[in-house]
Amino acid sequence: QDKPFLSAWPGTVVSEGQHVTLQCRSRLGFNEFSLSKEDGMPVPELYNRIFRNSFLMGPVTPAHAGTYRCCSSHPHSPTGWSAPSNPVVIMVTGVHRKPSLLAHPGPLVKSGETVILQCWSDVRFERFLLHREGITEDPLRLVGQLHDAGSQVNYSMGPMTPALAGTYRCFGSVTHLPYELSAPSDPLDIVVVGLYGKPSLSAQPGPTVQAGENVTLSCSSRSLFDIYHLSREAEAGELRLTAVLRVNGTFQANFPLGPVTHGGNYRCFGSFRALPHAWSDPSDPLPVSVTGNSRHL
């Protein structure tokens, strides 16, 4: 009951060369504490030292990876110290090259449906970690499947809700050095769609344009969306614009596509700034076709 609470800020996954703050909270409010590392390489700066409130550790090296506990000063205990805290595992990233992270069938996931996150690498990683940005809990640990070309893991996530949506990265590690991780994969934004009514999408001057002509796509709704997202079928990225309140009471964003050379099917979505990974239903698709060009789509 007198165990203090150890936490790591901004999180337990730390890039090599960066710093991490270890904070030891005593429930009674005793400010002094000691730190110990249970496994891996020793960290000399911890030994025979008393810290106050928190300890800024770094620049972090692979030697800092491992399990930490703290004891807070405790005048009423026979030893003068509390029982050891909960363990905190510090994982150091950047030790191996980054894996790749993909979403199947794609990163826009209907509310209530399931998405498969696939992390793969040409390095033979026995373990993968999946981490969502802004979450301080330990990342999800997954067992990799080894094959001749490297390794991979598939993680089925769902049913999709705004709580699961966010920016994901994955890391790889090898069995004998479990807390020394690869560099992070490129970030993957998983978005839950279908939470709000669909906006309308229209084209000015119209959906059929001459090659090289300017076209503007307007996304609008009576919902109080802060942001609109425009996506083109078969393209990974999306354009993003802030919504503006129009005289007619709609919230609108105009996407100038500039001189167009190729058409395509466009959709737009609305979202709120407070929940950037939660989007509306998609607008009805708007086919933009380009004349005077050998390729219409």
């Epitope: 009951q1 007198d2 609470f5 800020w9 703050t21 904070q23 909270r25 429930r27 009674l28 409010g29 005793f30 400010n31 106050r52 409130n53 928190s54 405790h74 005048p75 009423h76 205990s77």
Partner: antibody, heavy 119, light 107 residues
Framework: EVQLQQSGPELVKPGASVKISCKTS????????MHWVKQSHGKSLEWIGG????????NYNQKFKGKATLTVDTSSSIAYMELRSLTSEDSAVYYC????????????WGQGTLVTVSA | SIVMTQTPKFLLVSAGDRVTITCKAS??????VAWYQQKPGQSPKLLIY???NRYTGVPDRFTGSGYGTDFTFTISTVQAEDLAVYFC?????????FGSGTKLEIK
């Protein structure tokens, strides 16, 4: 349901002492830290100190050392705070407040006890 | 001890308004900041802990943010029952200290 029921208002003379109580129910008394907080009239809040009912361990705000003494009676699940050598500066509402295990020091509050020091 | 400087002291707003209160710590408190609401004649009630986490049962119109020394508490759409004094408090280092309070009044 967690409840912290504090003793009634006290009118005391300067130089005297007062002991106020915080009767708890709805949880295991010895598993949570009990803190005490002072609120002078129209002013902010000041942490006085905390006590661990499990072992009687205490931690005081230096400002209140010698002024406040925190104790518990585990058999009746009551926390006490005694204030001594009272002056008009000690006139205030005093709250007991329980922690939530580790996240927050003041998760549940008693209704407060008004102590008035007057000749 | 750590000083928590809270601003403004008073806020006069209409129902439906958005309200922001700020708290500045005299040194870094990481994210160890809580926010409390004290309605007239009542004891304080915990709203936000760890700077941005809503406590159990607290409506989602109440939000908090910040890290280090600068913290913000927001009521997205003020309601009549939000009439109260709001306090920030640092949980980082004892003695635990509170801001001076912001009195929210509804027009």
């Amino acid at each position: 349901e967690v409840q912290l029921q504090q003793s009634g208002p006290e009118l005391v003379k300067p130089g005297a002492s007062v002991k106020i109580s915080c009767k708890t129910s709805g949880y295991t008394f010895t598993e949570y830290i009990m803190h005490w907080v002072k609120q002078s009239h129209g002013k902010s809040l000041e942490w006085i100190g905390g006590i661990n009912p499990n072992n009687g361990g205490t931690n005081y705000n230096q400002k209140f050392k010698g002024k406040a003494t925190l104790t518990v009676d585990t058999s009746s699940s009551i926390a006490y705070m005694e204030l001594r050598s009272l002056t008009s500066e000690d006139s205030a509402v005093y709250y007991c407040a329980r922690d939530d295990g580790y996240y927050v020091k003041f998760a549940y509050w008693g209704q407060g006890t008004l102590v008035t020091v007057s000749a | 001890s750590i000083v928590m400087t809270q601003t403004p002291k008073f806020l006069l707003v209409s129902a439906g308004d958005r309200v922001t209160i700020t708290c500045k710590a005299s040194q870094s408190v990481i994210n160890d900041v809580a926010w409390y609401q004290q309605k007239p004649g009542q004891s304080p009630k915990l709203l936000i802990y760890y700077a941005s986490n809503r406590y159990t049962g607290v409506p989602d119109r109440f939000t908090g943010s910040g890290y280090g020394t600068d913290f913000t508490f927001t009521i997205s759409t003020v309601q009549a029952e939000d009439l109260a004094v709001y306090f920030c408090q640092q949980d980082y280092s004892s003695p635990f200290t509170f801001g001076s309070g912001t009195k929210l009044e509804i027009k």
